[in-house]
Interface confidence: low
């Protein structure tokens, strides 16, 4: 009597995640009577995948009708393949019994799964930084297989080199993750800049996935302050201007102080954007010199994006010549400055 053969013709099968995998198996004889079962892995820890005799297996269907007369084809189709399905599958013939007795196993078919990486997610620093500082951006993508993958960073189209990339796990796995960190030196012109993380993988057919982050979320451009006095008017009123320029983000509060006392507080809103993405703002304060007996110290105080306040001060000298015209002079561009106006 010829020995029963269990034939698995393919040594390996490669399938894209989401597709169906067909695992072929035929037997050479209907004798002895008994069921076929499919397992993933070998030995005592093997996992039952399908039992043509009985059971509930939602994603597995037989290719041929197992009740068909003279059926010797016990191939199965596994639907909606995921990386977790990778492994070696064995078609095993059992002899009918109580319980069934394992008779013969096929040589096994290795199922490998090609899984696309998830869309790269780029995250930037938790707090903003100013120009000349280095900030780190992180890019993550998960769930891909096989392990080979390429990740590149770009800033405004130019590839970045200060990059550290890791693919995990290091050993064999059903799927992998990649994490990469890029260090970027900020400049004042980076409000409109963008970093791109580009991931290339065999499953993407040459069309890489991209994740982006705007440097506008990471940068703070502190303002320049310039305080100038416009000409004194005939009614003894001095018009003092505080120009706040080239700042980002827009979140800014300006306070005028007269002799240390708050005169007016304003919040920047709906400002027009400069070409480089920064903002400018001008505030005016009208001071009635004749209402003061002593010198008037005017301070323009700016709080930008929650940072410590920056001050610019002017001293308006109340003298015997209050109507003398002042010049359009600006305070020096330092943190706190005073200028006497006669």
């Amino acid at each position: 009597e010829e020995e029963l053969q269990v034939i698995q013709p393919e040594k390996s099968v490669s399938v894209a995640a989401g597709d169906s995998a067909t695992l072929n198996c035929t037997v050479s004889s209907l004798i002895p009577v008994g069921p076929i079962q499919w397992f993933r892995g070998a030995g005592p820890g093997r996992e039952l995948i399908y039992n043509l005799k009985e059971g509930h297996f939602p994603r597995v269907t037989p290719v041929s009708d197992p009740t068909k007369r003279n059926n010797m084809d016990f191939s199965i189709r596994i639907s909606n393949i995921t990386p977790a399905d990778a492994g070696t599958y064995y078609c095993v013939k059992f002899r009918k019994g109580s319980p069934d007795v394992e008779l013969k196993s096929g040589a096994g078919t290795e199922l490998s799964v090609r899984a696309k990486p998830s869309a790269p997610v780029v995250s930037g620093p938790a707090v903003r930084a100013t120009a000349e500082h280095t900030v780190s951006f992180t890019c993550e993508s998960h769930g891909f297989s096989p392990r080979d993958i390429t990740l590149k960073w770009f800033k405004n189209g130019n590839e970045l080199s200060d990059v550290q990339t890791n693919v995990d796990p290091a050993g064999k796995s059903v799927s992998y993750s990649i994490r990469s960190t890029a260090r970027v030196v900020l400049t004042r012109r980076d409000v409109h800049s963008q970093v791109i993380c580009e991931v290339a993988h065999v499953t993407l057919q040459g069309d890489p996935l991209r994740g982006t982050a705007n440097l506008s979320e990471a940068i703070r451009v502190p303002p320049f302050l310039e305080v100038t006095q416009q000409s004194m008017r005939a009614d003894n009123q001095v018009n003092v201007t505080c120009q706040v320029t080239k700042f980002y983000p827009q979140r800014l509060q300006l306070t005028w102080l007269e002799n240390g006392n708050v005169s007016r507080t304003e919040m920047a809103s709906a400002l027009p954007e400069n070409k480089d993405g920064t903002y400018n703002w001008t505030s005016w304060l009208l001071v009635n010199v004749s209402a003061h007996r002593d010198d008037v110290k005017l301070t323009c105080q700016v709080e930008h994006d929650g940072q410590p306040a920056v001050n610019k001060s002017f001293s308006v000298k109340v003298s015997a010549h209050p109507k003398e015209q002042g010049s359009n002079t600006a305070a020096e561009n330092t943190g706190t400055n005073e200028r006497n106006i006669y």
Epitope: P35, E54, H56, P58, S98, D100
Partner: antibody, heavy 115, light 111 residues
Framework: RSVEESGGRLVTPGTPLTLTCTVS????????ISWVRQAPGKGLEYIGT?????ITYFASWAKGRFTGSKTSTTVDLKITSPTTEDTATYFC????????????WGPGTLVTVSS | ALVMTQTPASVSAAVGGTVTTKCQAS????????LAWYQHKPGQPPKLLIY???TLATGVPSRFSGSGSGTQFTLTITGVQSDDAATYYC???????????FGGGTEVVVK
């Protein structure tokens, strides 16, 4: 492919009764046989499935009240100690549910339990 | 244990109309799709209509359709015919192999 029940009759309470499902056109090594009953004026009620080899299972309410066995072409359902509540038409059907649904069904056999 | 709640208990429809019966499982059925629909007429055995929630059984007219997943399932008869007068049962399967439970049934009366 067909299944047919037999063995239904009038029995007194406590008298064991065996119903037989005879199959043709398919092999009992490939499919389980499920038993369903319908009491007069009531809905369908799943009893259990007699599978291949020693694989036999019953709904929780039916455990201890029924047993199952099979040969190459027949499946038996034994009502171990019938009560009047077991009066019903008993159906057998090929299949064990899910992707092996109950199909085809036999015409049914009537069991009456009365003293 | 799984409980299958079927609504309505009875529904009347005119020839050519549409009938819908719903089945709600007390927990997700096995594989989210272990749900079959059966047609039962007096004096006859039940007949399989739909299995795996939405797969039409061989020889069943396409006016019957099934939908749903998890715990909510629907059988729809579009273009009802007089021959469709029957009681319709859902059968849900739980994670345990013996946990197969019929709904209470929906009687369809065709006017």
């Amino acid at each position: 492919r067909s299944v047919e029940e037999s063995g239904g009759r009038l029995v007194t309470p406590g008298t064991p009764l065996t119903l037989t499902c005879t199959v043709s056109g398919f092999s009992l090594s490939s499919h389980g046989i499920s038993w369903v009953r319908q009491a007069p004026g009531k809905g369908l009620e799943y009893i259990g499935t007699i599978g291949t080899g020693v694989i036999t299972y019953f709904a929780s309410w039916a455990k201890g009240r029924f047993t199952g066995s099979k040969t190459s072409t027949t499946v038996d359902l034994k009502i171990t100690s019938p009560t009047t509540e077991d009066t019903a038409t008993y159906f057998c059907a090929r299949g064990s549910a899910w992707n092996d649904p109950f199909d085809p069904w036999g015409p049914g056999t009537l069991v009456t339990v009365s003293s | 244990a799984l409980v299958m709640t079927q609504t309505p208990a009875s529904v009347s429809a005119a020839v050519g109309g549409t009938v819908t019966t719903k089945c709600q499982a007390s927990q997700s059925v096995y594989g989210n799709n272990d749900l079959a629909w059966y047609q039962h007429k007096p004096g006859q055995p039940p007949k399989l209509l739909i299995y795996l929630a939405s797969t039409l059984a061989t020889g069943v007219p396409s006016r019957f359709s099934g939908s749903g997943s998890g715990t909510q399932f629907t059988l729809t008869i579009t273009g009802v015919q007089s021959d469709d007068a029957a009681t319709y049962y859902c059968l849900g399967g739980g994670d345990d192999e013996a946990d197969n439970v019929f709904g209470g049934g929906t009687e369809v009366v065709v006017k």
